[in-house]
């Protein structure tokens, strides 16, 4: 065993090349210089090492860089990245988007692993905010990335990053997340005109407050029912029948099919039946004529 720690004569590696795949684990340990490995990391990915051999190479790098690998090494880790633990990655300082892309490429097609989640976390924290280029990259690899962030994390997203978001990136976002993202989208898209603006903001409207929906209703936007059904119930309830009619335009007829579902059901309960009848859709459940409507939320605010 003791003899095996010494590198056999003539086996010392002068460079990282394909000949190393024939080395036993102990030979790699004994014959590959860690500094050489670090400078030639870009070659490792092209060589079909076994997982056991990759373990040895990782061990050598760990010994050389106990405080964490430098970015020059990280950028060329390739498949060796899959051997890293979240604890290893927490020691890194990754600042280059190219490095991030290279490592995400290794994991492409797989679910987001704890390693990748840690890497992204380190990268974003290092940058201080989730800028547009980063978000572009992350959503390209993981369309659901944005919706995996907490509302607190989303708060650091600058409005300019919202331009990188595609409608499908928001598919799994819940109302709390859209609450945070919608105002940022409103800021980001505010210099666009009416029709262009609505196309861009539509996916984010699940976070829109009542006042914004009222304003949109004046813009002839013709919101589709699928979008309307994703609106916050508390934002829809104060809308009048006339405002909902303007907001939906020709799609208003779709309310009938959704009258038993939120937010339509709750909205109907808040409207005067007379007003609902003006739509001619046969919507039932409104407040009968002659009844007094008390706005309890207003009363609570006053008390």
């Amino acid at each position: 065993e003791v003899e095996k720690t010494a590198c056999p004569s003539g086996k010392k590696a002068r460079e990282i090349d394909e000949s190393l795949i024939f080395y036993k684990k102990w030979e790699l340990e004994a014959c590959v210089d860690a500094a050489l490995l670090a400078t030639q990391m870009d070659r490792v990915n092209a060589i079909p090492f076994t997982y056991e051999q990759l373990d040895v190479l990782k061990h050598k790098l760990d010994e050389l860089y106990p405080q964490g690998y430098p970015e020059s090494v990280i950028q060329h880790l390739g498949y060796l990245f899959l051997k890293m633990s979240p604890e290893d990655i927490r020691k890194w300082n990754v600042t280059s988007l190219e490095t991030l892309k290279a490592l995400l490429e290794v994991n492409k097609g797989h679910e987001m692993s704890p390693q990748v989640a840690t890497l992204i976390d380190r990268f974003v924290k290092g940058r201080g905010q989730l800028d547009k280029d980063t978000l572009d990259t992350l959503t390209a690899f993981y369309p659901g990335y944005l919706c995996s962030l907490s509302p607190e994390e989303l708060s650091s997203v600058p409005p300019s990053s919202i331009w990188a978001v595609r409608p499908q990136d928001l598919d799994t976002c819940d109302p709390r997340q859209l609450d945070v993202l919608y105002p940022k989208a409103r800021l980001a898209f505010q210099n666009m005109n009416g029709s262009e603006y609505f196309v861009k903001i539509q996916s984010f409207l699940g976070g829109a407050p009542t006042e914004d929906l009222k304003a949109l209703s004046q813009q002839n936007v013709s919101m589709d029912l699928a979008t309307f059904m994703k609106l916050r119930t508390d934002a829809v309830l104060p809308l009048t029948v006339a405002e909902v009619q303007k907001l939906l335009g020709p799609h208003v007829e779709g309310l009938k099919a959704e009258e038993r579902h939120r937010p339509v059901r709750d909205w109907i309960l808040r409207q005067r039946q007379d007003d609902l009848d003006t739509l001619g859709l046969g919507l039932q459940g409104g407040i009968p004529n002659g009844y007094l409507v008390l706005d309890l939320s207003m009363q609570e605010a006053l008390s």
Partner: antibody, heavy 122, light 106 residues
Framework: EVQLVQSGAEVKKPGASVKVSCKAS????????VQWVRQAPGQGLEWMGI????????TYAQKFQGRVTMTRDTSTSTVYMELSSLRSEDTAVYYC???????????????WGQGTLVTVSS | SYELTQPPSVSVSPGQTASITCSGD??????ASWYQQKPGQSPVLVIY???RRPSGIPERFSGSNSGNTATLTISGTQAMDEADYYC?????????FGTGTKVTVL
Amino acid sequence: EVQLVQSGAEVKKPGASVKVSCKASGDTFNRYYVQWVRQAPGQGLEWMGIINPSGVSTTYAQKFQGRVTMTRDTSTSTVYMELSSLRSEDTAVYYCAESRVPGYNIFAMDVWGQGTLVTVSS
Amino acid sequence: SYELTQPPSVSVSPGQTASITCSGDKLGDKYASWYQQKPGQSPVLVIYQDNRRPSGIPERFSGSNSGNTATLTISGTQAMDEADYYCQAWDSDTYVFGTGTKVTVL
């Protein structure tokens, strides 16, 4: 008539923090976005950030990122702006302002507080 | 960073027209707002979304925006219009205010 009433003048030492409040009277305040703008003596206006009606979403100007925190207490219709690690250059009048003008995408500020003078001096 | 440049001062006789310009790269692609501020007072919004007037603002205030320049026009200027005026627009991740123009009514 809608009014935004801000807290009184403050004198702070360098390195300290200041928290300015902005309270609405006369209408349902929690329906609107609130922004903060400051003005150093004899200087122009400088935008600091914005907070949404529910208080869960904030966007800060890059210059103040990491030093400013805007919060909202919907139960008391009050918005707060806290600025930390104060330096002499932060001496200014701090204004809160609301976006109430009808508009689907703009954030023009049409209701303003009276301003709060914050003096940073050792 | 984005900059909006205004002339430091504009003088106008009562009843005449005052024009205040605000220049910025491709400013016409953004919406401009204008604020009036009198000494010791909070700013007042006079124009938003290039040319819209909030309720309570006199008709003599109007705005336009195209190319690289937004313009605030005060027709039939009155003594009460003497104040500082600031333009404002959104760029990337922040609202930018212009350098400010002092309007003096002679």
